[in-house]
Amino acid sequence: KSSNEATNITPKHNMKAFLDELKAENIKKFLYNFTQIPHLAGTEQNFQLAKQIQSQWKEFGLDSVELAHYDVLLSYPNKTHPNYISIINEDGNEIFNTSLFEPPPPGYENVSDIVPPFSAFSPQGMPEGDLVYVNYARTEDFFKLERDMKINCSGKIVIARYGKVFRGNKVKNAQLAGAKGVILYSDPADYFAPGVKSYPDGWNLPGGGVQRGNILNLNGAGDPLTPGYPANEYAYRRGIAEAVGLPSIPVHPIGYYDAQKLLEKMGGSAPPDSSWRGSLKVPYNVGPGFTGNFSTQKVKMHIHSTNEVTRIYNVIGTLRGAVEPDRYVILGGHRDSWVFGGIDPQSGAAVVHEIVRSFGTLKKEGWRPRRTILFASWDAEEFGLLGSTEWAEENSRLLQERGVAYINADSSIEGNYTLRVDCTPLMYSLVHNLTKELKSPDEGFEGKSLYESWTKKSPSPEFSGMPRISKLGSGNDFEVFFQRLGIASGRARYTKNWETNKFSGYPLYHSVYETYELVEKFYDPMFKYHLTVAQVRGGMVFELANSIVLPFDCRDYAVVLRKYADKIYSISMKHPQEMKTYSVSFDSLFSAVKNFTEIASKFSERLQDFDKSNPIVLRMMNDQLMFLERAFIDPLGLPDRPFYRHVIYAPSSHNKYAGESFPGIYDALFDIESKVDPSKAWGEVKRQIYVAAFTVQAAAETLSEVA
């Protein structure tokens, strides 16, 4: 139960009052306001929007609203020297060039400063060579090419379709395979849902539409020039050669009209199986190079983008807590967009704006939350989560001592089918209880709870009658809070039906066609899904900031730890000979998980029984809950990834968007049969089991009685 005790307020100021104040019409109005011009990170337009949000949050009633600026490495196309790709003949003449921009959507023809499609942080270069089609450029795709098909990508330009994994992983894989350039394209198989028209007549990607995006492999570092520290006025910056995560080969994105022209001429090997074929009318031959008649033609990339240190601005709003002002619950989402940001990020920013307005309304009526709530409008998320990471680096000592929870608020929708939640296990019960109290916006579920429609449409694979909640990966601003600092984190949005729509993300992601009209006409005309997401995100923040006992259930961590231990053991047992030879034991890990389970159970019993009127004991129990997530942090970080420090979860080494459990053990086991020194490789597996077992045991002990 939420509580209002000690905050000197009337009973009407509870969760219901906060939720009732949230209005779909306001979210709609805010979305329109935020999407009329581009708000690219580092531009004057985005600075002006930061100041507007600062001003409005002050008007809404927050105690203080400040801009926090940093000077970080960003990347832009050269305005006078555009990026493009050519097919050249044997004389070097360009016989085909890809488009220089996306045809603007209706009503936006005269908008200036639309950045053309580019891969942010691509180095400059004009490589030319034969093309190799590498499917999604996943680790397993390169294994198929190199090991099974014996195709060498060294010195080749590779063309990969977007989807399945983060684009930065694709580029890293191509680099490791020896490619000298990467072309990324959107295949209709992944970005054109059957039976839906392309924009502006529907929500599908037109042939001239292109996905922008950064291609960094930062592994949580933030600004590439100041890893670990804020990019402030007195920062020491690395030289560009020492910068973290920059790609070493030119990369450029194109749409499927242009991709058709490149892929239709491909020769060489046939695709290995149907999973390598998209939906274009091309053979999807792997190459290398073009077929017979065109075998003398090559592909040439022309990339002239520049990396520039540029000022960015976060907006940080504070609503001081009445009882525990030194405990922070953070709601943050980014403000910068690639172009108009109709979905990403402004569908999220508009929801944050309405949540701030609702909290402000309650505050003006005399209410305060028990704990401090911080609201953040992050900059430069699209360039590598830079704004959130720099702010967290600057404030890390405060955050690690005072951070209760972080709720992320990027895009509110990626579909309109059902809820999608990724969070720490500590928040499972909070999410379950909250969604049981909220009304479902779904057709056919009138009068039913959100929990009911969500569970029906997205059931848990393990527990019947419960909804699916996923692991946190990365690719968004919770990363530094969860993966580096160990602050309990969660995110929620409305999503598509993954069963029937197997395309990646939403079709117009990071294109010029991500407009206000896309949302208003096709995704959420009544803004009812936005309102539901506002209720979920806002409701989580309200409970985290206002409940007397933190709404964390440590027993749910015990359950998942057992599941993850079972899974990693099973992976390891696929190598029984080596397990026996090198005496690889999971006994310590299973024993630690058993201890955690028992101690968590006892802690939960004490949590029911203790005297909540004793502020010292209350604070002590709450601190044990708050610091549990922190206990899973290894100060040394994961191998070669020092800013990924959570031992239970990390972004997958093969897909930044996905979460991996026991990532240290998982990575040590990955492709272990190909390692040149098996003894050393299995030694590392044993070391990672030791680290995991120790961490789980240490975390368990933080829940034991203190004396």
Epitope: E462, R562, K563, A565, D566, K567, Y569, S570, S572, M573, P576, M579, K580, S583, V584, S585, F586, D587, F590, S591, V593, K594
Partner: nanobody
Framework: EVQLLESGGGLVQPGGSLRLSCAAS????????LSWVRQAPGKGLEWVSS????????DYAATVKGRFTISRDNSKNTLYLQMNSLRVEDTAVYYC??????WGQGTLVTVSS
């Protein structure tokens, strides 16, 4: 002391079935994931299947998927392997494994006409 005792092996014709059991003692049975591993005559060890805390979390080698079913009864401290549609190439000594280092002595399964 950890003890794993397999039983249920024997001679069976191709297409036949067998159910292997592994009685466990000396440890908190329900707290551990368990596996079956086999070794065909003159060959190396081959993982067959693993099971987690309950009968929902199971994993199988491609060679046995759809034919073999792993299960456990935590109240009896026993692990099982139901083997159907047996083939000649399933002939092997089958071992029950806890945590990677504790192995049973094995039970021989011979599939022959």
């Amino acid at each position: 002391e950890v003890q794993l005792l397999e039983s249920g092996g024997g001679l069976v014709q191709p297409g036949g079935s067998l159910r292997l059991s592994c009685a466990a003692s000396g440890f908190s049975f329900s707290s551990y994931a368990l596996s079956w591993v086999r070794q065909a005559p003159g060959k190396g060890l081959e993982w067959v299947s693993s099971i987690g805390e309950n009968n929902h979390t199971t994993d199988y080698a491609a060679t046995v998927k759809g034919r073999f079913t792993i299960s456990r009864d935590n109240s009896k401290n026993t692990l099982y392997l139901q083997m159907n549609s047996l083939r000649v190439e399933d002939t092997a000594v089958y071992y029950c494994v806890k945590d990677g280092v504790h192995w049973g002595q094995g039970t021989l399964v011979t599939v022959s006409s």
